[in-house]
Interface confidence: low
């Protein structure tokens, strides 16, 4: 799921202090960020042995996942790193800190610490300001749920090094203009607002200038008030697959839900030659079923060594207290020659999805 190199968001760390126990901190990071979660001991006392947990499973340290008693660092984050993270006391399993982490494509809306976009010596004698990373500034509309941390960035250069200032709805924007203040990171060309609220909605403009000129960029921030909704599903492509006998197949389904969803993978089946029951409800068999703690879950159904009877319609179903959402997936299984012919036909049609 990584972006192409030229588009990739280069790594940057975003350290976030832990919330009060029992509260859930909602955090959004960009793909490629270093996700850094900090959980100081409650009341400043001794921490004792802790364990970091993601979506109910203990995290195993690796080259990419660095686990410490008070801090978790996930390097080069991708969509799969989205989920519910908690730091727990090892003995009691008491949750000390709880974070909901979502990793999206750029731009990141976490904070920025690493100074990676500091003003650089451009090698130009004199020059008006210019954007150094315009590809990072494509997303003009940022819509985030209330309580998230938002960051707007305008990485620029020029000689002499330009200054940056920020406007909100066309007027000078300063920390005292919002509860919770703002962080202006001039060396990272960024404006950071923590725990956004609906009154933070508006147009934010960075003005970058030196004596040779001025450039500006406007972003629109929409803060989504959390109104409960049914789960939202996105089917990972390809939703319909053709597989060769004996091969492995994987279906992807992305589930978004503020309320804890009950997620199921189902398969349509026939009972006594009928696909539906007397009341018209389709017959299904439950392949996987679990409650997700995550606001955004990337769920997969893996079918190994498929046979002809694995063919048919599969369902990804998510239910929360508001409603139900479903996505259908189709699998057709063929012997080697039939599958090759189908792929050739698909190739001629200009679209190949190898099973």
């Amino acid at each position: 799921e990584s972006l192409g190199t030229e588009q990739r968001v280069v790594g940057r760390a975003a350290e976030v202090p832990g919330p009060e126990p029992g509260q859930q901190e909602q955090l959004v990071f960009g793909s490629g960020d270093a996700v850094e979660l900090s959980c100081p001991p409650p009341g400043g006392g001794p921490m004792g042995p802790t364990v970091w947990v993601k979506d109910g499973t203990g995290l195993v340290p690796s080259e990419r996942v660095l686990v410490g008693p008070q801090r978790l660092q996930v390097l080069n984050a991708s969509h799969e790193d989205s989920g519910a993270y908690s730091c727990r006391q090892r003995l009691t399993q008491r949750v000390l800190c709880h974070f909901s982490v979502r990793v999206t494509d750029a731009p990141s809306s976490g904070d920025d610490e690493d100074g990676e976009d500091e003003a650089e010596d451009t090698g130009v004698d004199t020059g008006a300001p210019y954007w150094t990373r315009p590809e990072r500034m494509d997303k003009k509309l940022l819509a985030v749920p209330a309580a998230n941390t938002v960051r707007f960035r305008c990485p620029a250069a020029g000689n002499p090094t330009p200054s940056i200032s920020w406007l909100k709805n066309g007027r000078e924007f300063r920390g005292e203009h919002r509860i919770g203040g703002i962080k202006l990171r001039h060396q990272q060309w960024s404006l950071v607002m923590e725990s956004v609220v609906p009154s933070d909605r508006g147009n934010y403009t960075c003005v970058v200038e030196n004596k040779f000129g001025s450039i500006r960029q406007t972003y629109t921030l929409d803060v989504l008030e959390r109104s409960p909704h049914r789960p939202i599903l996105q089917a990972g492509l390809p939703a319909n697959q053709t597989a060769v006998l004996g091969s492995d197949v994987e279906f992807h389904c992305k589930v978004y839900s503020d309320a804890q969803p009950h997620i199921q993978w189902l398969k349509h089946v026939e009972v006594n030659g009928s696909k539906v029951g007397p009341d018209g409800t389709p017959y299904v068999t439950v392949l996987k079923s679990w409650i997700s703690e995550s606001v955004e879950a990337d769920v997969r159904l893996r079918l190994a060594n498929v046979s002809e009877r694995d063919g048919g319609e599969y369902l990804c179903r998510a239910t929360n207290f508001i409603g139900v959402a479903e996505k259908a997936f189709w699998l057709s299984v063929h012997g080697p020659r039939a599958a090759e012919e189908e792929l050739v036909e698909a190739d001629e049609a200009g679209s190949v999805y190898a099973g």
């Epitope: 509309l141 819509a143 929409d222 989504l224 109104s227 409960p228 909704h229 049914r230 939202i232 599903l233 996105q234 009341d279 239910t319 207290f321 508001i322 409603g323 139900v324 959402a325």
Partner: antibody, heavy 122, light 108 residues
Framework: QVQLVQSGVEVKKPGASVKVSCKAS????????ISWVRQAPGQGLEWMGW????????KYAQKLQGRVTMTTDTSTSTAYMELRSLRSDDTAVYFC???????????????WGQGTLVTVSS | DIQMTQSPSSLSASVGDRVTITCRAS??????LNWYQQKPGKAPKLLIY???SLQSGVPSRFSGSGSGTDFTLTISSLQPEDFATYYC??????????FGQGTRLEIK
């Protein structure tokens, strides 16, 4: 604040078409759906269909399939409902309602337009 | 389609009364039920969602309960502005979204 403002009264002849508009303000239009609900004089509420502003996906009530088309214009934050081949039993007040879910319909309708009376009469 | 049946169809009550309206689904809809209030010439207004959650800005005298197939809307102490028509709506199985036929609450 969130508002849905609908177009005005329409009088149509049987067989004609009507297009009702619903202009949204006070929220990010594309992150929600719009459902259309109608109410014949002295009758209850009847759901007509839904459109996702996010991706243009639609779901229509079976009895209206083929006669109704729902569209949106994100540049003006406006939703439209067109009903063709009008009959006298299409005389009703037509409401648009914000559907709080932008991928599938079925969310409680938290904001409604004021209604548009459509009279079909020869 | 899931059918929603409200009872009674109409009801007379006085200010201060406790009033209960019931809604029955033709099959289980878990807690995916919403209640609306509609006054003559006006659009419906959401009162209760998910069977028992009070919509923001709605007075606390309104409450909802039930799950599965049987649901109730209760107004603990009727106020003059509560005389209206009330509709239940299921959001479990869509399309179609289906409403009850309505309960008209009149002044006795």
């Amino acid at each position: 604040q969130v508002q849905l403002v609908q177009s005005g009264v329409e009088v149509k002849k049987p067989g004609a078409s009507v297009k009702v508009s619903c202009k949204a303000s006070g929220y990010t239009f594309k992150f929600y759906g719009i459902s259309w609900v109608r109410q014949a004089p002295g009758q209850g509420l009847e759901w007509m269909g839904w459109i996702s502003v996010y991706n243009g996906k639609t779901k229509y009530a079976q009895k209206l399939q083929g006669r109704v088309t729902m569209t949106t214009d994100t540049s003006t934050s406006t939703a439209y409902m067109e009903l063709r081949s009008l009959r006298s039993d299409d005389t009703a007040v037509y409401f648009c309602a914000r559907d709080g879910d932008y991928e599938s319909s079925g969310y409680p309708f938290d904001y409604w337009g004021q209604g548009t009376l459509v009279t079909v009469s020869s | 389609d899931i059918q929603m049946t409200q009872s009674p169809s109409s009801l007379s009550a006085s200010v201060g009364d406790r009033v209960t309206i019931t809604c029955r689904a033709s099959q289980s809809i878990s807690s995916y039920l919403n209640w609306y209030q509609q006054k003559p010439g006006k659009a419906p207004k959401l009162l209760i969602y998910a069977a028992s959650s009070l919509q923001s800005g709605v007075p606390s005298r309104f409450s909802g309960s039930g799950s599965g197939t049987d649901f109730t809307l209760t107004i603990s102490s009727l106020q003059p502005e509560d005389f209206a028509t009330y509709y239940c709506q299921q959001s479990y199985s869509t399309p179609p979204i289906t409403f009850g036929q309505g309960t008209r609450l009149e002044i006795k």
